[in-house]
Structure formats: C-alpha cells, structure tokens
C-alpha cells in the first residue's frame, strides 16, 4: 500500500487551531515534477457534505512530502469529508477523513467501519441532543432509510446493512429530519472486495494474518498497519510517537500523538494513534489495552507487562505476542519481511533459526504460496543460529505472494511469513526518439514507455548500421539522460534499439522495437569570400563570390546568402541551389537600407562557415517614372525623345537617365544622362541608319526612379555608319554614361 497518512488535529476548543496534515513516506512524493509524479493534494470534498461558504482554506507545503490545510474560521468549516491524494500512476491513492461536529444532535459511536464482503455492517448513531422526529439515513448524500425516533435502542439509532458488497462503500449519515445537516452523524463504510482473510482478483489468495489491528488489502494482500505498527504483518511496534510504514514519521508537539486522528489508505480507514482512544483521541488506554483506539488486549503471560503503545513487554527468556513462547522454542531470526526477485530467476533464499535443541538443516523448510515445500540444499551452523539456504526453482508470476519459513524441533515450532514480489523485467513498448543529428553523431532520448515493472536501473542502447550483420554496439546510460551516439558514419542509416533493466539479478528485459536513425551529410568546410557587389537599382543588388581551390569534389549543394537589416531586426535569406554558381541577383530589397551581407556553402541541412560580412547601403527609392515618353526619327542618325515630368515628386529632379538599346540586339544597353532636369525633350545623335531602337528613361532625385514605358523608333535609311549615339538637349551636346 502507498505510505500515505492524513492526520487531523482534534483539539477542538478553537477551530482556528485545527489543521489537517497529509504526510507521504513515498520516495519523491509531492515534488510534482515528471520524474517523481504528481504532488500531494489535500482538499475538502464538498460533494456529499456541503457546508456554508467561508474564507478559502490555506494550503501550506512543508518540504516535498507534507502538506497542511489550515484557516478554519468556525466549527462548521470542519464538518464533512477531507481527502488527501498521493502516489503516482497506478499507485495513486486517496485517503479520506470524515469530521463530525462534537455538538451534533447525533454522534457516531465509531466513524470508520471496515468490513468484509458479505458481512453485516452495523452503523450506530448515539443521541447527543434528542429530537422527537424521524431519523433519516443517507448513503453518499442520497436517501437510504428512515427510522422512527421511538426505534432508538439504548439511546442509539442503528442501521443494519446485511450482506454488504463493495459498492455499498461510502459516506453514510444519520440526521434528525428537521435538524441542520451539520448536526448529522457521519460515518465511513469501507467494504473489502473479498471475504474475511482473502485477497486477489478472485479472492483466492490467503491474507498473511495481519496483527495488531492491521487490515489485509484486498488487491495486493499487504497489511495496512495501524499507526504505530510496522512489518509485513504489523508485528512490530514503533517507538512511542512514531508512525508511517517504517515508523519514519514523528507526531508533532510535546504530547506525541494525543489528540490526533490518523487516516490511512483503504481498507484501514481512520483511528487514533497507538495508545489513545476516544472521540477526540485524548484518552489514554485503560490498563490491559493497547494499540490504535486501544482496541487490542494485552493478555500478557509469564510475567509480561502491558505497554499501551506496543503491547506485551516480555521478561528475559520469553517472546511472542503474549510472551507465550519460551526462548527454548525455536525461533526464526531476522527474516526480511519482503523480498523482490525478477521473473525466471533462480534465487537463493536464506532462513536462520535458533532454539534449544539447535535446529539442523532438515528441520527448516520453505513453503511457497501454492503449498510446495522446498528443502534446504545447504546449512551454515554457527554457535547462535543455523542458516538454511534454499535454491528456488525458476520463478513464475504465480510465485508472488506470501512464503513461509518454518522451523520444527522437539522444543516446538516457529514460522515466519514473508512476502515475495516477482517482478517482470521492463520491455520498451516504443522505439527511442531521435532528438538531433549531425554527420557523425545522433542524440537520442532512450527512456520510453515500457511494460513490466520499474524502477529502471539502467538503459542500454544497441545500435549498428542498417542492413549490417556486424555486432551491435552498446552504450549504457543513465535512465534520465539523453544519449549521444558518437563516431558514426555520415549519411548512414542506423538501427537503434533500447534495452531496459530493473534492479536485481535477471532484471534485464528484452530489447525494444528498432527504429531507423540516419546521420546527416558531412558538414561543408569551405569558407567563401565576397568578391564584390553592385547596386542595380534601389531594391536590387548583384553579388559575386569565390571559393578557395581544394583538391577533390566540392562538398556542397548550394549557397545561402544572408542579408541582415539591423535597423529593423530582419534577416533575408536567399538560396542559390547550384554549387557552381558564383553570382546572384537579390531583388525586392528595401531602398535606403544598410545591409550586412554574407554567403555560406550548404550541404543537406548543414551550413558551412560564413564569409566575412560586407556592409552595403542601398540608395533611397527614386521618383516616379516620366510620363508619355515619345520617340520621333529626325534623320538617318537622330531620334528626338519627348516626355512629361513625373507627378507627385518628393523633391527636385537632379537629372534624367535615358536607356538606348538596339531592338533585338544582344549587347548591353547604353545610358545617357540628361543633366538639365527642366527639359522635356532631347535628341539622341550618332545612331545607325535604318536601325530599330528601344528607348526608356527615368528620373533621379537622390536615387534613381522607376523606368518609364519603353518606346520603339527606327532611324531613316541609307546614312553612313555612325560612331555611336549621342544626345543633344536644346542643341547642347551630352556625353554617354555607360
């Protein structure tokens, strides 16, 4: 069972001093991270017992395994059901505490009732303040039964529940019909899923015989021990004031566990701590009684004395619950209460015994849960004890349960039951996950969901190239860390599998399913450098670069050009998908912007070193295009251009640029500046006769503007070959700007 205790402080003179504390003895409880499972939850459960709304209760976490609820302002805040939830996964467990008002009309004689399937449960509500009206019993908040107030017996109203079944479990209440529900007597009924002394899915297994008021859990056969007792069968008392499955917790305050109610996982329920009784757990046990709620009687023999916390304290020479066993009677010594082995292992189990006459090898035997008796293969005889060693046949799951070591001599016999847990080695249900890859390494997350039992002690990762028959390489890693597989071959598929192990011999599980993980290409190592660049417009940039000459083939698929606009914090990436390319035109840039430019070689998804950066300033955007451009041939070597100024100019035009190109020609165009921006016509001279030309123009303010429409015109025929076109604006000659 989960080691979870809900403590209620019942010193009720002042509700503001009342508190509930939930304590977990589970490893890592309450940390709330993925590694350790969800945190402890402590809350009031208002589904059945609803109380008037008040200020919210305060939850305080004390370390990783304790949570406390405070902030109760009035007695009615306390009435009802509280629950603590702890443990992770399938072990998540809810512990419930039911609080009754001490001033209620009806009070429960006993709050928690744990009964076996098929038993008759009797809930008894004692009359505290009488009313002459019907008494209504409810189950989980719904009507269940009515009693006439005349039906009280010895001042008590009894509800008999014959042949109870697990669905009958829950919160029961008895209320005078016209009284406040807060004046009800509240009970908790826990119905074990099996008959007395049985546990398991078909109730076929026998309980270990829990001592000192411990209750056998119907699912796992473990004893849920009362507060103050420990051991597989609750055979051992804790020191006064201690509780928890290993007696590891201590009651707060100077008066120990006085005034505290302890609630444990079902099917135990709640009780006072060992040595205390009463509705508020403030009364010490009467002489001769001990244990939780003082329910146990000492009945010590042979001069034993009764301790209200631990039971009989035996004089020298005697032992046993009632000091009924002489020390001459053989006695099993130091037997572990619980052992854990892995499936299909063949463990050795030791059992030591002492006594007079001295036990010999044949007098000690080991009995399995199915009744099979094993005889020891070897015995080690020492002056004070004999230790028998048993070689256990290959374990199967059915061997889980309570084993018994028994010693018999002419002086008598003794036996000690202990629990054997047969655990299934873990087997991964999924393949490991690839996190990142490089050309020679893979980073893998190895821990996946698994079948079988934890905890995971080691993780082995097996890997080899795909379709290879070579031996698997193996790496052993920490369960909580990612693994880096190193020294791999680039661009190679690897089959990768996980193998999980749990503690103990034979804890290695089968390999999990394989997955294919492929290493990346080799990283490109060459660093390009920028040869040059020039602006081809306010938003266009032509870039050229080079690579060092190295022997062998080029490792690369192309180039990545990066332009960084620091002002706007934006990066532009241009992919050049040919490794032979050494130039690129970048378009759609932002005019008037400072760019940092670099280029790097790429291969698959990997980038090589970047070139040293260059800083480029694009000119600001120019004016709109000139309008209504028109061309008119004047002679065999002259064509006149006319236009209208651009509209909506952002400033004065500094010049116009005319582009002249032979139609259908393959040569570069020629550019001619018109330096008188006020003009709206110009003559282009020096053209070839009978030749068709294309013209367009643009204005410049700080930067060049948009091109106008293109116009075509042919020179007149049969002239001489001209030296090349020139321009005249109002008879002024201009040179070429090529």
């Amino acid at each position: 069972a989960v080691d979870l205790t809900l403590l209620a402080n019942l010193r009720l003179t002042d509700p503001q001093r009342f508190f509930l504390t939930c304590v977990s003895g589970e490893a890592g409880a309450g940390r709330g991270s993925d590694a350790w499972g969800p945190p402890l939850l402590l809350e009031k459960d208002d589904r059945i017992v609803r109380t008037p709304p008040g200020p919210p209760l305060r939850l305080a976490r004390n370390g990783s395994h304790q949570v406390t609820l405070r902030g109760f302002s009035k007695p009615s805040d306390l009435v009802g059901v509280f629950s603590c939830v702890g443990g992770a996964g399938a072990r998540r467990t809810r512990v419930i505490y039911v609080h009754n008002s001490p001033g209620a009309h009806l009070l429960p004689d006993k709050v928690t009732h744990t009964v076996n399937k098929g038993d008759t449960a009797v809930l008894s509500a004692r009359v505290h303040k009488e009313k002459q009206t019907d008494v209504i019993w409810k189950s989980n908040g719904s009507y269940f039964y009515t009693l006439d107030w005349h039906e009280a017996q010895d001042g008590r109203f009894l509800l008999q529940l014959p042949n109870v079944q697990p669905p009958s479990s829950g919160i029961y209440s008895a209320t005078y019909l016209e009284a406040s529900p807060l004046g009800s007597a509240f009970f908790r009924l826990i119905v074990r899923g099996c008959g007395a002394g049985r546990w398991g899915p078909g109730c076929t297994k026998e309980c270990p015989g829990c001592l000192h008021g411990g209750v056998c859990h119907d699912h796992d056969g473990e004893c849920v021990c009362p507060p103050g007792f420990t051991g597989t069968r609750c055979e051992q008392a804790c020191r006064e004031g201690r509780f928890g499955q290993s007696c590891q917790e201590q009651c707060p305050g100077i008066s120990g566990c006085r005034g505290l109610t302890f609630c444990l996982p079902d099917p135990y329920g709640c009780s006072c701590g060992s040595g205390w009784r009463g509705s508020q757990c403030q009364e010490a046990c009467a002489p001769g009684h001990f244990g939780a709620d003082c329910r146990l009687q000492c009945q010590c023999q042979n001069g034993g004395t009764c301790d209200r916390f631990s039971g009989c304290v035996c004089p020298s020479g005697w032992h046993g619950v009632h000091c009924e066993k002489s020390d001459r009677i053989p006695q099993i010594l130091n037997m572990a209460s619980e052992l854990e082995f892995n499936l299909e292992t063949m463990p050795r189990i030791n059992c030591a015994a002492a006594g007079n006459p001295f036990p010999v090898r044949g007098s000690i035997e080991l009995r399995k849960p199915d009744g099979t008796v094993l005889l020891s293969t070897k015995a080690i005889v020492e002056p004070e004890k004999t230790t028998a060693e048993f070689e256990v046949p290959r374990l199967v799951l059915a061997d889980s349960g309570f084993w018994e070591c028994r010693v018999s001599t002419s002086g008598g016999q003794d036996s000690r039951r202990f629990k054997v847990n047969v655990k299934v080695p873990p087997v991964p249900l999924a393949a490991p996950r690839l996190l990142t890859k490089q050309s020679r390494q893979l980073v893998v997350s190895p821990l996946v969901s698994f079948s079988g039992d934890g905890p995971i002690s080691t993780v082995r990762l097996h890997y080899r190239p795909q379709d290879s028959t070579m031996d698997w390489s193996t790496i052993v890693v920490d369960p909580s860390e990612n693994v880096t597989l190193m020294n791999l071959r680039p661009k190679t598929g690897y089959s990768v599998r996980v193998q999980l192990s749990r503690p103990g011999e034979g804890g290695e599980g089968a390999w999990g399913p394989p997955t294919l993980m492929t290493t990346d290409c080799p990283e490109p190592l060459l660093q390009p450098w920028l040869e040059g660049w020039h602006v081809e417009g306010t938003d266009r940039l032509r870039v050229s670069w080079s690579l060092p000459l190295v022997p062998g083939p080029l490792v690369g698929d192309g180039f990545l050009l990066r332009l960084w606009d620091g002002t706007r914090g934006q990066e532009r990436r241009e992919n050049v998908s040919s490794p032979q390319a050494r130039t690129a035109l970048l378009t759609g840039l932002t005019p008037g912007t400072h760019y940092q430019l670099d280029v790097q070689l790429y291969h698959c998804t990997l980038l090589g070193p970047a070139s040293p950066p260059a800083h480029v300033l694009l000119p600001p955007s120019g004016p709109p295009a000139p309008r209504h451009l028109h061309a008119q041939a004047l002679s065999d070597s002259e064509i006149q251009l006319t236009w209208k100024h651009p509209e909506a100019l952002p400033g004065p035009i500094s010049k116009y640029v005319v582009e002249v190109q032979v139609a259908g020609g393959a040569g570069d165009p020629l550019w001619i500046d018109v330096d008188r921006p006020e003009e709206t016509s110009t003559i282009i001279r020096g053209l070839n006769a009978s030749t068709r030309y294309l013209f367009r123009m643009r204005a410049s303010i700080q930067g060049l503007g948009d091109w106008s429409n293109t116009v075509e015109e042919s020179t007149l025929g049969n002239g001489l070959q001209a030296e090349g076109p020139v321009q005249e604006s109002r008879a002024a000659e201009e040179g070429l700007d090529q």
């Epitope: 002459q132 009206t133 019907d134 209504i136 409810k138 009507y143 269940f144 039964y145 009515t146 009693l147 006439d148 107030w149 005349h150 039906e151 019909l177 016209e178």
Partner: antibody
Framework: EVQLLESGGGLVQPGGSLRLSCAAS????????MSWVRQAPGKGLEWVSR????????RYADSVKGRFTISRDNSKNTLYLQMNSLRAEDTAVYYC????????????WGQGTLVTVSS | QSELTQPASVSGSPGQSITISCTGT?????????VSWYQQDPGKVPKLIIY???NRPSGVSNRFSGSKSGNTASLTISGLRAEDEADYYC??????????FGTGTKVTVL
Amino acid sequence: EVQLLESGGGLVQPGGSLRLSCAASGFTFSAYVMSWVRQAPGKGLEWVSRIYPSGGGTRYADSVKGRFTISRDNSKNTLYLQMNSLRAEDTAVYYCAKEAGGSYFLDYWGQGTLVTVSS
Amino acid sequence: QSELTQPASVSGSPGQSITISCTGTTSDVGGYNYVSWYQQDPGKVPKLIIYEVYNRPSGVSNRFSGSKSGNTASLTISGLRAEDEADYYCSSKTSSVTYVFGTGTKVTVL
C-alpha cells in the same frame, strides 16, 4: 416505474374484519415509509396510518387507533392494513401511498380499493 | 385538530389567478415546512403538485406555486385553465409525526 396495487377491499358487516394488501414494485420498498389514506364517498382525504421501513415504528389517526393495524413484509414488498371492529364510517376507498425519502409527503399513490361496511 | 381548513370552493375565469388557503395550527402547518398539496380529478387518484411548502415535482406546471405565512399555507394557480378544474387538498406533518389533510377545495373554471 413505481407501482402500488391495493387489494382486499369488499363488503363487510359492521364489527367485521378485513385485511388490505398493497403490492409495491419499482423502488426499494424496504427503505421507505409507507402510508394508508382513505376517502369516503364524496368526501375529502383522510390519513389513516404510516409504518417505518423496519416495521418497528407505526402511527395511526385517532379515528382508527386500537382497531386498525399496519404492517409490512419487506421480503414480499407488501404493505398490509388489518381492519377490525369495522364501522359504517370506515366505508371509503383506501389508498396505499409511498412517502418520499427524507421528507413528509406522499409522492406515489395506488389506484385504491373500496371497502364498504354495511349490514 | 383532525383537519386543516380550506375554502369549500374557489372559482375563476380562464387566465385569471386564484389562491386556495389552508389554515392549521402551530402543531402542524405553522410548526413545520412540510406542507404538500394534491390535485384530484373526479374519480381519479390524488396527484402531488407541491411539496415542502413551495417545491414543485418535475412535470408539474409552473403555474402552480405554494407559500406559507404563520399557520396558513396557500396554493396559487396562475393563468387558470379548464384542465385545472379539480379538487385540491393540502396536507401537513404534525407534531406527533402523523399527517393531517385539509377539508378540500373544489376549483371551478368559469
């Protein structure tokens, strides 16, 4: 569906006896308080008796106290009314009714059975 | 007291509201919030229409409402309809944990 079916009514002479039965179904009979209510021809409703689930507690109207006995058999899901020393004024339709759990009202009624006391 | 007092008859036109009173003592109506009302059509079984003074069972029209003041409980039928014509009885728990019924009221829809 809750059903209550009365039987046992008929003609009886003054001073005679009659036993009415009410067969219940559709609910957990053994958990609920049950009542008998009667209605004389052309008159109003008159509560007669009630019995608690265990059968250990009973109540009667003053007009029938000492003459009528209410009882129940939870194993048979049946309610009874034993009527002795019958009088002419006991002539009525007798209804068996289920009391709501945890309150005082009658949420389901049977169809009734007629008892006629006449010489 | 053997019976609670109700008016013998109450009438109203369709669409009107009518109220039926039910007067008892501090030992019944005045002492508890356990007043219920039943509707009985001629020759039929009584049907619960109000419980615990003002609660309506599911399926009962919200034209029926209940209230209580002192020793008198009331049933109001608003938006009177022809099908509301019936006998109406109040009932209360008593201090001796018994029931007492009212004398009954015949409701006529004009």
